[in-house]
Interface confidence: low
Amino acid sequence: QRLPRMQEDSPLGGGSSGEDDPLGEEDLPSEEDSPREEDPPGEEDLPGEEDLPGEEDLPEVKPKSEEEGSLKLEDLPTVEAPGDPQEPQNNAHRDKEGDDQSHWRYGGDPPWPRVSPACAGRFQSPVDIRPQLAAFCPALRPLELLGFQLPPLPELRLRNNGHSVQLTLPPGLEMALGPGREYRALQLHLHWGAAGRPGSEHTVEGHRFPAEIHVVHLSTAFARVDEALGRPGGLAVLAAFLEEGPEENSAYEQLLSRLEEIAEEGSETQVPGLDISALLPSDFSRYFQYEGSLTTPPCAQGVIWTVFNQTVMLSAKQLHTLSDTLWGPGDSRLQLNFRATQPLNGRVIEASFPAGVDSSPRAAEPVQLNSCLAAGD
C-alpha cells in the first residue's frame, strides 16, 4: 500500500532551496531543537555488524586488514545523523564492547569534526531547502525502484543502534536516479523529534517536519561502502518527510508496532519483509536533489540527496510511538536525533519540477532563479 500523499507539491509550501544559505536560522538551535552534536555513524553499525550503511549510519571504514582486504556491504556500519545543535558538533564515544571504532552521539563532546574531519567540510548535510531558489531541471526524471516489494520471508533485521532505528535491507533492491545512475539499497532509518518538537533533518524554508525517513543506497559502481565514501555519487539517499495525518499508515505500522521489542539501545528484532516503497511518497517524479554528505560521522561528502516533494502521512499516535519508545545511550530517551542544517556554501539545489512557480507565499517577491546544471543530460 502506498503511503498517502500529504502535499502534492512542495512539501514545505515552496520556499527557497537554500542555495546560498551560509548559516541559516535553522543552523542555529531553535527552541524546538535542543542543541545536539552531530552524530557520526553508530558503532553498532560498524563493519562486521551486518548493518548496511545507512545515510546517517554510513559505515565507518575499518582498515582493510581487519576485513582481510574487503568489507562486505552487510558488514559496513551505518551512519546516523546528529541533531540540531546550536553549533553542529560531532561526538564520539565507545558504544560496544569489542568494537574498536569510535562511537558518536548527538550532543556532547568531542565535536564531530574531531571524530571525523569530514564533518567540517564545506558541502555537508542536511540543508534547508528553499523551493523558490531551486533550479528546475527537466533532465531529472522520475526515480525508478526495482525489487522494493519484499515477501514476508526472509525476515529483516530491525535494530535500535542508539541513534536511530534501522532496517537492514536484503540484496536486490535497486534504484535508478536516471540512466547510468544506478544504486542498491542498503538500509533505511528514521530521524525524529520529541513530544511537540519536530525532528526532520532537512527543513523547507526553515520549517522542520515531525520526522524524516532515509533510505541509503550504494552506487553499483562500487562493491563496498568504504570504496564509495567521499566519492561523488558513491552513495545516494532517498529522503522523505513524515507528517501527521488523520489515518494510521499501515506500511509504517509494520515497523512501529515492533519498536517496543527494541526499546533498549543495541537491541534488535526480526520483522517480516514488507513493501519498502510503501514507506515512501507515491510521487517519484517531484523531488529536490543536491550533493551533500552523511548527516552523521564520518560525514563523508559526495552523497547524492534526493528529497521528495510529497510527504508521507502517519497518525499522531504513530508519530508519538516513534519518538517516545526507544532509548539511547546513557539511559536517555532516543529523541531529537537530527543534525542541524548546514550551509549550502554555493551549492545549488535542483528540482525535478518547477518548484518556484506559484508554490511559495513569497512568489510575488523578485527571485533570482538558478539554472539547471544538468540541462543537457
Epitope: 526524471r141 525508478e144 525502484l145 526495482l146 535508478a176 547510468g180 544506478e182 516503497s277
Partner: nanobody, 120 residues
Framework: QVQLQESGGGLMQPGGSLTLSCAVP????????IGWFRQAPGKEREFVAA????????QYSDSAKGRFTISRDNSKNTGYLQMNSLKPEDTATYYC?????????????WGQGTQVTVSS
C-alpha cells in the same frame, strides 16, 4: 486511458521461437519499466520478465530464465520479449505492462494481451 498494445503472438511448434512486441505511449516508455506477464486458461496471471526504463536491469521468472530475453527500444517506444525453445506449457495470453517498478503490483498500464499457443 493509456493502452499498451501487444503483438506477435501465434501458433508455434515446440522448440520454436517467437518475439512479442509491446507498443508503449511515448510519455510512458520514457521512464517506466516494462513487464511481461502471462495467463494460461484456468490459471492466475504470472510474471514472466521485466526491464527497467534505462534497460540496465532485467528480471525473469524461473521458467523464463535462459529461454526468454526481454529488451526495449526507447527510440521506437517498444518493448520486446523474445521466446526461444518454446514448450507447450508456455501456451497462454501474454500481457505487457508499464509501471514505475518492475513488480506487477505497481504497474499502472496494461495491454489487452496476445495469444501464444505452443502445440505440435
Amino acid at each position: 486511458q493509456v493502452q499498451l498494445q501487444e503483438s506477435g503472438g501465434g501458433l508455434m511448434q515446440p522448440g520454436g521461437s517467437l518475439t512479442l512486441s509491446c507498443a508503449v505511449p511515448r510519455f510512458t516508455l520514457d521512464y517506466y519499466a516494462i513487464g511481461w506477464f502471462r495467463q494460461a486458461p484456468g490459471k492466475e496471471r504470472e510474471f514472466v520478465a521485466a526491464i527497467s526504463w534505462s534497460g540496465g536491469t532485467t528480471q525473469y521468472s524461473d521458467s523464463a530464465k535462459g529461454r526468454f530475453t526481454i529488451s526495449r527500444d526507447n527510440s521506437k517506444n517498444t518493448g520486446y520479449l523474445q521466446m526461444n525453445s518454446l514448450k507447450p506449457e508456455d501456451t497462454a495470453t501474454y500481457y505487457c505492462a508499464a509501471g514505475r517498478q518492475l513488480e506487477w503490483r505497481t504497474y499502472d498500464y496494461w495491454g489487452q494481451g496476445t495469444q501464444v499457443t505452443v502445440s505440435s
